[in-house]
Amino acid sequence: YSNFRKSVDSTGRRQYQVQNGPCSYTFLLPETDSCRSSSSPYMSNAVQRDAPLDYDDSVQRLQVLENILENNTQWLMKLENYIQDNMKKEMVEIQQNVVQNQTAVMIEIGTSLLNQTAAQTRKLTDVEAQVLNQTTRLELQLLQHSISTNKLEKQILDQTSEINKLQNKNSFLEQKVLDMEGKHSEQLQSMKEQKDELQVLVSKQSSVIDELEKKLVTATVNNSLLQKQQHDLMETVNSLLTMMSSPNSKSSVAIRKEEQTTFRDCAEIFKSGLTTSGIYTLTFPNSTEEIKAYCDMDVGGGGWTVIQHREDGSVDFQRTWKEYKEGFGSPLGEYWLGNEFVSQLTGQHRYVLKIQLKDWEGNEAHSLYDHFYLAGEESNYRIHLTGLTGTAGKISSISQPGSDFSTKDSDNDKCICKCSQMLSGGWWFDACGPSNLNGQYYPQKQNTNKFNGIKWYYWKGSGYSLKATTMMIRPADF
């Protein structure tokens, strides 16, 4: 018996099997499976990409293609040999032993083989074309790489040359820096020596200043003692003169006028020849009671008796009626001279009031009243002012007509509230009014939006707290 079978083996290769009696002939045909599927960018019959991804990749792929080509060539040669060696004998036997219909089978196998061979040949032709194409491209790329390499080599040479130049410059600059460092070290040493000398000098000066300050304090005390001694001596001299001369003697009056030792205000001190600003002792009118005051002998011709001063918040101005009456603080710094003294002084002669103000932006302003006096304690030291001029507002920031003085323990204002309690400090509050130079002291950057600060409304508005204030008086006829 005889039959023909076409099947696929376990590896997926096609095989042709011819069974003829006891003999079986199997033809294993070479497969095209070693060629990549068309999804591959380098598959035969696929469109060739413009250029390989990179040089190394191209070389690798070329080697793969060459291997495939080699394999296919070997297959073909084996197949030819196989056909030549074995088929000749078999064909003779088949012709002798099989019937006509098996010739047809053989023809089919032959045709199939020829078709396979033709397909293989076509594929090989494609691959050869691709390899040539690829090789040409690679050659072009190699040429381009070669040109690029030459350019790079030239650039490297140029850069090397530049680096050498820069190194030379660097060496030169390094040398310069080293020279400069040397000089700098010398200068630093010199400066350190100078600094040490200056520190010694500063230390010496500090001790000198301390000594001078001590001497100043002593001198101030001595000055007061001397004034008192002079005052006592003059009284003794006057007593002696009175005893020696008759009551209508003119000489005693002349001496008294010449040697005035008690001063009711700074204007009298100025006129006596003492024209340096500082602390002086004043005497209450018609009394021997004394009070220390700061005399400003520089501003506007001098002779000013300072009745209030604020500058740094070192003194608490939220004080009682008694304290405002008698005065508090230090005439060298922040202080209130005292309502009783000012009332008595301004009640005897016509005085002018000057108010000097400083804000936190470096501006200064003043208000000058050509007539100022305080009523007595029975009228709550009510303030009277007329004739305003100056730069701190065209309208008076002290309410007109004058208000009574109020303190935290004596409410004499026109508000339902207690302005002194509300706004802090003793002042001539209205309800509560446009000013309060005795308010809470606020430092810079905390001095705005304050109800209870140092206020002068017609210069800086309602919420602004001033940096410094001075209230001073002087006789109108000075």
Epitope: C415, I416, C417, K418, Q421, M422, A431, C432, G433, P434, N449, K450, F451, N452, K455, Y457, Y458, K460, G461, S462, G463, Y464
Partner: antibody, heavy 121, light 107 residues
Framework: QVQLVQSGAEVKKPGSSVKVSCKAS????????MVWVRQAPGQCLEWMGY????????GYNQKFEGRVTITADESTSTAYMELSSLRSEDTAVYYC??????????????WGQGTLVTVSS | DIVMTQSPDSLAVSLGERATINCKAS??????VAWYQQKPGQPPKLLIY???TRDTGVPDRFSGSGSGTDFTLTISSLQAEDVAVYYC?????????FGCGTKVEIK
Amino acid sequence: QVQLVQSGAEVKKPGSSVKVSCKASGYSFTDYNMVWVRQAPGQCLEWMGYIDPYNGGTGYNQKFEGRVTITADESTSTAYMELSSLRSEDTAVYYCARTRDRYDVWYFDVWGQGTLVTVSS
Amino acid sequence: DIVMTQSPDSLAVSLGERATINCKASQDVYIAVAWYQQKPGQPPKLLIYWASTRDTGVPDRFSGSGSGTDFTLTISSLQAEDVAVYYCHQYSSYPPTFGCGTKVEIK
């Protein structure tokens, strides 16, 4: 009689600015300070700042510092409040009000009718 | 900032009865406290200033008291027209601050 009349309601986008006006009548505009107070839905009243029309002096609540500007035009007796960089939480009724005292920002005796400002994208 | 805390948040009182609203300041504000009444859709209206002084035209059934940190607004005999939200306000120091209000209703 003394009256403060405010401008109408506004709808604004976040990041924009709004300027509300308040026209005073029946009294001397420069004799009293003017304040601005806002009332957000379900929130407390919030004081924003004041202006003294006499000298142009202003004071602001630190919460709004840098975003609020209060101005006054004496010739028209009108105060203005401008709030910039608006956000949704600025949605509120904004009131102008007169202070009883020229020299101090005490209590507020006359109020405008309010201006609703809605901030929405 | 000074915090003004009102209590209660709301209050229901029968007509003719007394209504009492409290306000507590977080620090001493002396007597610098005002009270305002606000009806729906209207601006606030000044009732009391300096803790106890009635503003012009305010009925005498409204009274205020207190000093320092504790303040009270009293409506001695509640009327229908008194239904509103009431706010306290301190002006002792910057910034002036308000309480968050007490709603008064009729029981």
